[in-house]
């Protein structure tokens, strides 16, 4: 059974992941982003089901495409903090949260999504899990 300290650790990791995802979304989803129109043309796979921490496997598998699209956004008038570091941090948290005991085959929804829809989906996921822990 999960202890209160492990629950607290999970909660903090989820909050960190949530903040990182929100910061990415805040950085791209505004009119000052000169590459937004182009970024919205890239398609991301969405999880068919995302209700448990193990479903973070589906996020992990999309981190490489996410990094590529974020690299596209970099310009002198637009700054995300170092994309490689950001994605690496997210990857570390995701690996810790989902655990490595069981490797899940991720099931994706039929419809693909824009980067904004993709990030919003995983933000909602984090918020939902956090609310069950508190």
């Amino acid at each position: 059974a999960p202890t209160s300290s492990s629950t607290k650790k999970t909660q903090l990791q989820l909050e960190h992941l949530l903040l990182d995802l929100q910061m990415i979304l805040n950085g791209i989803n505004n009119y000052k982003n000169p590459k937004l129109t182009r970024m919205l043309t890239f398609k991301f796979y969405m999880p068919k089901k995302a209700t448990e921490l193990r479903h973070l496997q589906c996020l992990e598998e999309e981190l490489k495409p996410l990094e590529e699209v974020l690299n596209l956004a970099q310009s002198k008038s637009f700054h995300l903090r170092d994309t490689k570091d950001l994605i690496s941090n997210i990857n570390v948290i995701v690996l810790e949260l989902k655990g490595s005991e069981t490797t899940l085959m991720c099931e994706y929804a039929d419809e693909t999504a824009t980067i904004v829809e993709f990030l919003n989906r995983w933000i909602t996921f984090c918020q939902s899990i956090i609310s069950t822990l508190t």
Epitope: L25, N26, K32
Partner: antibody, heavy 126, light 111 residues
């Protein structure tokens, strides 16, 4: 001093079109993004659209996407909002507001929505 | 879209007394550039909105120092230290971290 003056409002039937204008003075219009915001009678504020300083990028609220078009003429210091397929729920006072400043090195800065026009009333009714 | 929720809906205050308005955002408003783009607007009866505060706590030019803003992340507050008759109107919080969204407004009236 900064001045924004909207015009073009009036009473229009559902399904018809209307074009609003916003005449700007007192600042370098071609260096600023510009917004349209609306306010239904007795209600709160709703962002409608934004256009970049150079007119290249335009973004819209979902409620008006595909029906409204924002544009600008920097030589005339004027912002426009072309409203097609008007609906009763588009009835509102429409305000133009100044957005962020874009400098020559390619950076946006400054406050969004720092100056507003007096507004022009659009009534959609049969 | 980011949802901005303001409380209270209405705030009857006595002249010279303080007033406080809260605003909560559905998302953290910290932008990747390090700024938090949360503003406060005042709309007097029959007037267009007017910018009071930007980036949480910066007073716009010409705004009296009785107005102050505070907060971080998702929770923000506008305070009027001593309410004057000219402060009557509706106050809106708004975010421009993402595409702009407004709070529902708080009506400040004199008791």
């Amino acid at each position: 001093q900064v001045q924004l003056v909207e015009s073009g409002g009036g009473v229009v039937q559902p399904g018809r079109s209307l074009r609003l204008s916003c005449a700007a003075s007192g600042f370098t219009f071609s260096s600023y993004a510009m917004h349209w915001v609306r306010q239904a009678p007795g209600k709160g504020l709703e962002w409608v659209a934004v256009i970049w300083y150079d007119g290249i990028n335009k973004y819209y609220a979902d409620s008006v996407k595909g029906r409204f078009t924002i544009s600008r003429d920097n030589s005339k210091n004027t912002l426009y909002l072309q409203m097609n397929s008007l609906r009763a729920e588009d009835t509102a006072v429409y305000y133009c507001a100044r957005g962020s400043y874009y400098d020559s090195s390619g950076y946006y800065f400054g406050e969004d929505f720092d100056y507003w026009g007096q507004g022009t009333l659009v009534t959609v009714s049969s | 879209d980011i949802v901005m929720t303001q409380t209270p809906l209405s705030s009857p205050v006595t002249l010279g007394q303080p007033a406080s308005i809260s605003c909560r955002s559905s998302h953290n408003l910290l932008h990747s550039d390090g700024n938090t783009y949360l503003s406060w607007l005042q709309q007097r009866p029959g007037q267009p909105p007017r910018l009071l505060i930007y980036e949480i706590s910066n007073r716009f030019s010409g705004v009296p120092d009785r107005f102050s803003g505070s907060g971080a992340g998702t929770d923000f507050t506008l305070k009027i230290s001593r309410v004057e008759a000219e402060d009557v109107g509706v106050y809106y919080c708004m975010q421009v971290t993402q595409f702009p969204t407004f709070g529902g407004g708080t009506k400040v009236e004199i008791k």
